[in-house]
Amino acid sequence: KGMHAAQPAVVLASSRGVASFVCEYGSSGNAAEVRVTMLRQAGSQMTEVCAATYTVEDELAFLDDSTCTGTSSGNKVNLTIQGLRAMGTGLYICKVELMYPPPYYVGMGNGTQIYVIDPEPCPDSD
């Protein structure tokens, strides 16, 4: 079944290469297990950046080596991507799946354009 997911259109990464935004999805009702996937679209290619599952009882948890972190509250997920470089500029799409209990719902946001500007190297001091 289809479901709406919303995310901001544009986000500017910090000078440290960190970008955060909220992904909000249509009310979960009794959704007990939710899977959140961050996808990056470059041209016609879509690649998975990171994914995490959380339950109504347990907090959102990405893998330890993931480039993403996040927190969940109701039908909102606050996502943070780290280690971004200028070449990481692109459209980041939030995909939400309400896995359990049935029925299964899936929703995809329109994407957040993340702009990453690499910091200028510090000039050598004499």
Partner: antibody
């Protein structure tokens, strides 16, 4: 603390209707489904179905389609089990149980006796 | 419907012994998410069932670590490492992966 408190024992005649309540407290009622489980005297547990406490949509096990109805009074954080046209084989203890990804909290049970 | 078959029906044990209860499902109970919604409950006489284990092997809060769950696919086991008097009662497995969700027939743990 989380509690599910069910209504008291019922004695009914065949053909009558019973409505059992399950009042929840200590958590957000609409975040968890409410399940109903039947246990006939000396028998095991039988899952009857569940109701989505956010949408009100019920799901029934095949054996309980027809005479059984789940309902809600969301403002009172209460779920109901109604059984119509009672039969002797409806004599049992009925439990409500909250479910996220597990049946973690249960009501104390309501004993229904159907006898002419 | 998924049939959950528990063995044995009755398990006489001495206090301090290890007890093992088996639960077999008639088909795989791995859910589409990859999770397996297999749970174990204990019901003591005159009481409501109590959750012990969920998702095959996760112990519910407050459940002693002498209880452990294992298994995958269609075969699951509940082990009690050192049986205490308070562990006596009827144990039920339950699958919440495929509707209608179903209980096993129960295993009665009793003193030998």
């Amino acid at each position: 603390q989380i509690q599910l408190v069910q209504s008291g024992p019922e004695l009914k005649k065949p053909g009558e209707t019973v409505k059992i309540s399950c009042k929840a407290s200590g958590y957000t009622f609409t975040n968890y489904g409410m399940n109903w489980v039947k246990q006939a005297p000396g028998k095991g547990l039988k899952w009857m179905g569940w109701i989505n406490t956010y949408t009100g949509e019920p799901t029934y096990a095949d054996d309980f389609k027809g005479r059984v109805a789940f309902s809600l009074e969301t403002s009172a954080s209460t779920a109901f089990l109604q059984i119509n046209n009672l039969k002797n084989e409806d004599t049992a203890t009925y439990f409500c149980a909250r479910r996220g990804v597990r049946l973690d909290y249960w009501g104390q049970g309501t004993t229904l006796t159907v006898s002419s | 419907d998924v049939l959950m078959t528990q063995t044995p029906l009755s398990l006489p044990v001495s206090l301090g012994d290890q007890a093992s209860i088996s639960c077999r499902s008639s088909q795989s109970i791995v859910y589409i998410s990859g999770s397996t919604y297999l749970e174990w409950y204990l019901q003591k006489p005159g009481q409501s069932p109590k959750l012990l284990i969920y998702k095959v092997s996760s112990r519910f809060s407050g459940v002693p670590d002498r209880f452990s769950g294992s298994g995958s696919g269609t075969d699951f086991t509940l082990k009690i490492s050192r049986v205490e008097a308070e562990d006596l009662g009827v144990y039920y497995c339950f699958q919440g992966s495929h509707v209608p969700w179903t209980f096993g027939g129960g295993t009665k743990l009793e003193i030998k």
